[in-house]
C-alpha cells in the first residue's frame, strides 16, 4: 500500500476582501487514521484554522460532504476575509497517536493573498487660511489596501500636478498598506472656485479610481481692495462718501467709519453681491452733514477681514461753501442703504 | 432521544424483491451518513450498505452489490434499501444503523432489525 | 478486502479482568470500534476511536489499538457484560467487522 499523500494543488490564491477563499488539499489514503489540521504559517507560532476532529470554527466549512465515508477531500472554505487573514495555510495530516494526534505528513502550502480596496481618500488642507501667491499643503490619505503597488496623482481643477511627495507604508512584507501623500498648491485669486483633488488608482478597482476631494473656498483668503468716493451731493450741506469693499473671501468682514479718527459707525458686511470669481463686493455709504463743521474732515473707511489686521482708505472731504463740486461722481451701487447725518 | 425504527421485512422468495425502510427521529437526519448492517441467524455481524448524509455517495459490500439499492429521504427522515434478486443466503435481521459524526464514525446508534426472510 | 479476525469465545470469571482481541493487518493504523450485544437485542456501541467510551458505557470497559491488535478490556467483570461482543475498523467506506467473540462470565 503507498504511503500516504497530502496534496495542495494551488500554490497560490487571490481572494477579493469579503469573499470566500477556497483552499483545496486531498489525501492519497484513508491510512492511518488520524485528523487533518489546517494551519495558517510554519512552526511553533503557527495558528490553527481547522480541525477535522474537534473544535467549533465558525468561519470555516468544508468542501465535501464530511459524511461520506471515504472522504479524502480535506478542502476548506473561509468566509469574509480580510487582509488579516493573507498567509500560506497548510493542510496537515495527524495520525492517531496517545495521548495526542502526532504529525504525519504536511502538503506544500498554499498562500492566500487578499485584495483589498484602498479607503475612500481623506485630503486635509492647512489649518489656518493662507492669501494668493501663498504655496498651501495638501495632505492625501488612504488605508487597508493589498496588494502594495498603488497609484496616486494630485490635480486642481483637472490639472494634473506635479509637486508633491508620495509614502507607501509600511515597507515590507505587510496583511495591507496605507499611503501618505503631501501636494505644494501655490494660490491664485481666482481659486475660490478651485478643487484639488486627490485620485487613488488600484488593482482592486477595476479602472474606476477613488477621488478625495478639497475645496480651496476652505482654504483661501482674498484681502479686500478699498476705494472711498464721494457721491453728489443729495441735498445742501449733505454729502454722501461711500466705501466700496472688492473682492474678498470670505465673506466674514467688518467695516468702521472713522471722522478725523473718530469711531462714526461699525457694521458687519451683510447684503454682498458675489463675484463671478466667487470673492464678494460691498459697499458702505456715510452721508456727511458738512455745515456741522468748520474745518476739512479726514473720512476713514477701516476694514477688518477674517479676523486679519484692519485694513483702511481714507477721503478728505474739504469744507467749503461747494462741497457739491468735489470728489468723484462714481455711481453708487445700491447695495447698502447706511445712512448717517453728523451734527 | 434518538430512535430508529425498522419495518418491511417478511417473508420472501428466492429471486423476489423487498423494501425496508427505516425511520429516523431524534436527531438531524440530514447531517449523517446512515447504514444498514445484517445479521443471519446465529451468525456475525455483516454491513451490507451506506449513504452519506446528503444521498450523494453510497457504498455497498461485494455480496449484494448490483442487487441493492439504498436510498434516503431527508424530507421524511426515512432510510430505505431495495432488495432485488433475493437469495437464501440473504435471510437475516437488518439492522439500521446510524453513523456518529464526520471523524471515523462508528454506529453509535442501532434500530431493532427486522427479520428477512427469503425461502421457497 | 480487510480482514478482522477475533477468538470465538473468552470465558472470565465474575470481578476479573476480561480481555477480547480483534487482529488486523495495521489494525493499529486504523481506528478501533467494538460493539456488545447481548440475544435478542441490537448491537451497543462500547468502544469508538480506539479508547473513547460513549456516554453511559461503564468505565470498567476500556480499550487500546497498536500493532496489529486491538483489544477490548473489561475490569471487574460483571454477569450482565455476558454477550457477544464484535470489533469493527471504523475508518473505511466499506464497514469491517470482526466475527465476534462470547463472553461467557462462569
Known amino acids: 500500500e503507498e504511503e500516504l499523500q497530502v496534496i495542495q494543488p494551488d500554490k497560490s490564491v487571490l481572494v477579493a476582501a469579503g469573499e470566500t477563499a477556497t483552499l483545496r488539499c486531498t489525501a492519497t489514503s484513508l491510512i492511518p487514521v488520524g485528523p487533518i489540521q489546517w494551519f495558517r504559517g510554519a512552526g511553533p507560532g503557527r495558528e490553527l484554522i481547522y480541525n477535522q476532529k474537534e473544535g467549533h470554527f465558525p468561519r470555516v466549512t468544508t468542501v465535501s460532504d464530511l459524511t461520506k465515508r471515504n472522504n479524502m477531500d480535506f478542502s476548506i472554505r473561509i468566509g469574509n476575509i480580510t487582509p488579516a487573514d493573507a498567509g500560506t495555510y497548510y493542510c496537515v495530516k495527524f495520525r492517531k497517536g496517545s495521548p495526542d494526534d502526532v504529525e504525519f505528513k504536511s502538503g506544500a502550502g498554499t498562500e492566500l493573498s487578499v485584495r483589498a480596496k484602498p479607503s475612500a481618500p481623506v485630503v486635509s488642507g492647512p489649518a489656518a487660511r493662507a492669501t494668493p501667491q501663498h504655496t498651501v499643503s495638501f495632505t492625501c490619505e488612504s488605508h487597508g489596501f493589498s496588494p502594495r503597488d498603488i497609484t496616486l496623482k494630485w490635480f486642481k481643477n483637472g490639472n494634473e500636478l506635479s509637486d508633491f511627495q508620495t509614502n507607501v507604508d509600511p515597507v515590507g512584507e505587510s496583511v495591507s498598506y496605507s499611503i501618505h501623500s503631501t501636494a505644494k498648491v501655490v494660490l491664485t485669486r481666482e481659486d475660490v472656485h478651485s478643487q484639488v483633488i486627490c485620485e487613488v488608482a488600484h488593482v482592486t478597482l477595476q479602472g474606476d479610481p477613488l477621488r478625495g476631494t478639497a475645496n480651496l473656498s476652505e482654504t483661501i483668503r482674498v484681502p479686500p481692495t478699498l476705494e472711498v468716493t464721494q457721491q453728489p451731493v443729495r441735498a445742501e450741506n449733505q454729502v454722501n462718501v461711500t466705501c466700496q469693499v472688492r473682492k474678498f473671501y470670505p465673506q466674514r468682514l467688518q467695516l468702521t467709519w472713522l471722522e478725523n479718527g473718530n469711531v462714526s459707525r461699525t457694521e458687519t458686511a451683510s447684503t454682498v453681491t458675489e463675484n463671478k470669481d466667487g470673492t464678494y463686493n460691498w459697499m458702505s455709504w456715510l452721508l456727511v452733514n458738512v455745515s456741522a463743521h468748520r474745518d476739512d474732515v479726514k473720512l476713514t473707511c477701516q476694514v477688518e477681514h477674517d479676523g486679519q489686521p484692519a485694513v483702511s482708505k481714507s477721503h478728505d472731504l474739504k469744507v467749503s461753501a461747494h462741497p457739491k463740486e468735489q470728489g468723484s461722481n462714481t455711481a453708487a451701487e445700491n447695495t447698502g442703504s447706511n445712512e448717517r447725518n453728523i451734527y | 432521544e434518538v430512535q430508529l425504527l425498522e419495518s418491511g421485512g417478511g417473508l420472501v422468495q428466492p429471486g423476489g424483491s423487498l423494501r425496508l425502510s427505516c425511520a429516523a427521529s431524534g436527531f438531524t437526519f440530514s447531517s449523517y451518513a446512515m447504514s444498514w448492517v445484517r445479521q443471519a441467524p446465529g451468525k456475525g455481524l455483516e454491513w451490507v450498505s451506506a449513504i452519506s448524509g446528503s444521498g450523494g455517495d453510497t457504498y455497498y459490500a461485494d455480496s449484494v452489490k448490483g442487487r441493492f439499492t439504498i436510498s434516503r429521504d431527508n424530507s421524511k427522515s426515512t432510510l430505505y434499501l431495495q432488495m432485488n434478486s433475493l437469495r437464501a443466503e440473504d435471510t437475516a435481521v437488518y439492522y439500521c444503523?446510524?453513523?456518529?459524526?464526520?471523524?471515523?464514525?462508528?454506529?453509535?446508534?442501532w434500530g431493532q432489525g427486522t427479520l428477512v426472510t427469503v425461502s421457497s | 478486502s480487510y480482514e478482522l479476525t477475533q477468538p470465538p469465545s473468552v470465558s472470565v470469571s465474575p470481578g476479573q479482568t476480561a480481555s477480547i482481541t480483534c487482529s488486523g493487518d495495521?489494525?493499529?493504523?486504523?481506528?478501533a470500534c467494538w460493539y456488545q450485544q447481548k440475544p435478542g437485542q441490537s448491537p451497543v456501541l462500547v468502544i469508538y476511536?480506539?479508547?473513547k467510551r460513549p456516554s453511559g458505557i461503564p468505565e470498567r470497559f476500556s480499550g487500546s489499538n497498536s500493532g496489529n491488535t486491538a483489544t477490548l478490556t473489561i475490569s471487574g467483570t460483571q454477569a450482565m457484560d455476558e454477550a457477544d461482543y464484535y470489533c469493527?475498523?471504523?475508518?473505511?467506506?466499506?464497514?469491517?467487522f470482526g466475527g465476534g467473540t462470547k463472553l461467557t462470565v462462569l
Open positions: 469493527q475498523a471504523c475508518d473505511s467506506s466499506t464497514a469491517v
Open positions: 495495521k489494525l493499529g493504523d486504523r481506528y
Open positions: 476511536q480506539d479508547t
Open positions: 444503523a446510524k453513523d456518529g459524526g464526520s471523524y471515523y464514525p462508528p454506529f453509535d446508534y
